[in-house]
Interface confidence: low
């Protein structure tokens, strides 16, 4: 059972403090570092032995509305030969984020805060071997 | 979540825009609580790029533990165990969003904040560049 | 999956002793807050005590100076220590942690999860 709470209680609540209605938060979502742009060397995603293809995942319901995800290209590996090598694998590499979901019931509108699982690239793996008996 | 009332009538234009603030839920929703993979990964330390993972806390941030990876060596590892000189590891950086207590200290008052994480690394062709 | 499994409920006298432990098991690579919340009939979920992974401490006011948390990281394991008990320190107790781990290649960083309880009666 898995239940994600946001505020622990023994945080020591100071005067200043904005009241809160009982099992909310409030949530400013002007972002901090806005602007701050992400340095990765130049088309990894492309020079990788594990490349990947990015999709871009878009929900009006959803802050940021849109989501990158990325999908490796290959099950196994590019070689120095430029060859798919299936001796080796592909495989996600993951992280979590969190997203702000907009819920219509009825004529009243909702905010709940959600995770959401991101593949961010892949990277090449030495397979796992199961040997069977 | 914690519901507003939208004003009578009940347009059904929809809002383009998030409002500036908001009040949500304490619990967090999380569409991926539902796959229960069969077994662990090591995809760090099996990975021809691999990465030790840095843990940054933060107990003014949700969440207050965030593990950033950096990659063991400049070359990738080869078939035969060794590093590669002629390859490159290279961080995958992502841009999180992440809840940032705002005052500080305030149990149940947060702001989103952008923060940029490396997740693992990824080995690479490197760029060569020729000097004429 | 992480489980986390709580022993040492039980039927205690008013003034008495009681030492609760938790352990959590599964592919876990850091445990960064392990704690107790308690339950009691009718009443809300409520913090009893937490402790970080550097060592340090938070409890709840009503508990202070009377429960101890401590934890051995070696086994992913929590203890609280509950020292003249009250019969108000009757209720189910929780063990909580927030645990970063791998699972099918995927790292979860600070996921929050639950023990399904231990009673605690403070009854003469």
């Known amino acids: 059972r898995k239940i994600p709470k946001v505020g622990h209680t023994f945080f020591q609540k100071p005067e200043s403090c904005p009241p809160v209605p009982g099992g909310s938060m409030k949530l400013d979502i002007g972002i901090i570092n806005e602007n701050q742009r992400v340095s990765m060397s130049r088309n990894i995603e492309s020079r990788s032995t594990s490349p990947w293809n990015y999709t871009v995942t878009w929900d009006p319901n959803r802050y940021p509305s849109e989501v990158v995800q990325a999908q490796c290209r290959n099950l196994g590996c590019i070689n120095a030969q430029g060859k798919e090598d299936i001796s080796m694998n592909s495989v996600p590499i993951q992280q979590e984020t969190l997203v702000v979901r907009r819920k219509h019931q009825g004529c009243s509108v909702s905010f709940q805060l959600e995770k959401v699982l991101v593949t961010v690239g892949c990277t090449c793996v030495t397979p796992v071997i199961h040997h069977v008996q | 979540g914690i519901t507003i009332p939208r004003n009578p009538g009940c347009p059904n234009s929809e809002d383009k825009n998030f409002p500036r603030t908001v009040m949500v839920n304490l619990n967090i929703h999380n569409r991926n609580t539902n796959t229960n993979p069969k077994r662990s990964s090591d995809y760090y330390n099996r990975s021809t790029s691999p990465w030790n993972l840095h843990r940054n806390e933060d107990p003014e941030r949700y969440p207050s533990v965030i593990w950033e990876a950096k990659c063991r060596h400049l070359g990738c590892i080869n078939a035969d165990g060794n590093v590669d000189y002629h390859m490159n590891s290279v961080p995958i950086q992502q841009e999180i969003l992440v809840l940032r207590r705002e005052p500080p200290h305030c149990p149940n008052s947060f702001r989103l904040e952008k923060i940029l994480v490396s997740v693992g690394c990824t080995c690479v062709t490197p760029i060569v560049h020729h000097v004429a | 999956e992480v489980q986390l499994v709580e022993s040492g409920g039980g039927l205690v006298q008013p003034g008495g002793s009681q030492r609760l432990s938790c352990t959590a098991s599964g592919t876990i690579v850091n445990i960064h807050v392990m704690g107790w919340y308690r339950q009691a009939p009718g009443k809300q979920r409520e913090l009893v005590a937490l402790i970080f992974s550097g060592g340090s401490a938070d409890y709840a006011d009503s508990v202070k100076g009377r429960f101890t948390i401590s934890r051995d990281n070696s086994k992913n394991t929590v203890y609280l220590q509950m020292n003249s008990l009250r019969p108000e320190d009757t209720a189910v107790y929780y063990c909580?942690?927030?645990?970063?781990?791998?699972?099918?290649?995927?790292?979860?960083?600070?996921?929050?999860?639950w023990g399904q309880g231990t009673l605690v009666t403070v009854s003469s």
């Open positions: 909580a942690a927030e645990i970063g781990y791998y699972s099918g290649g995927t790292y979860y960083s600070s996921e929050a999860h």
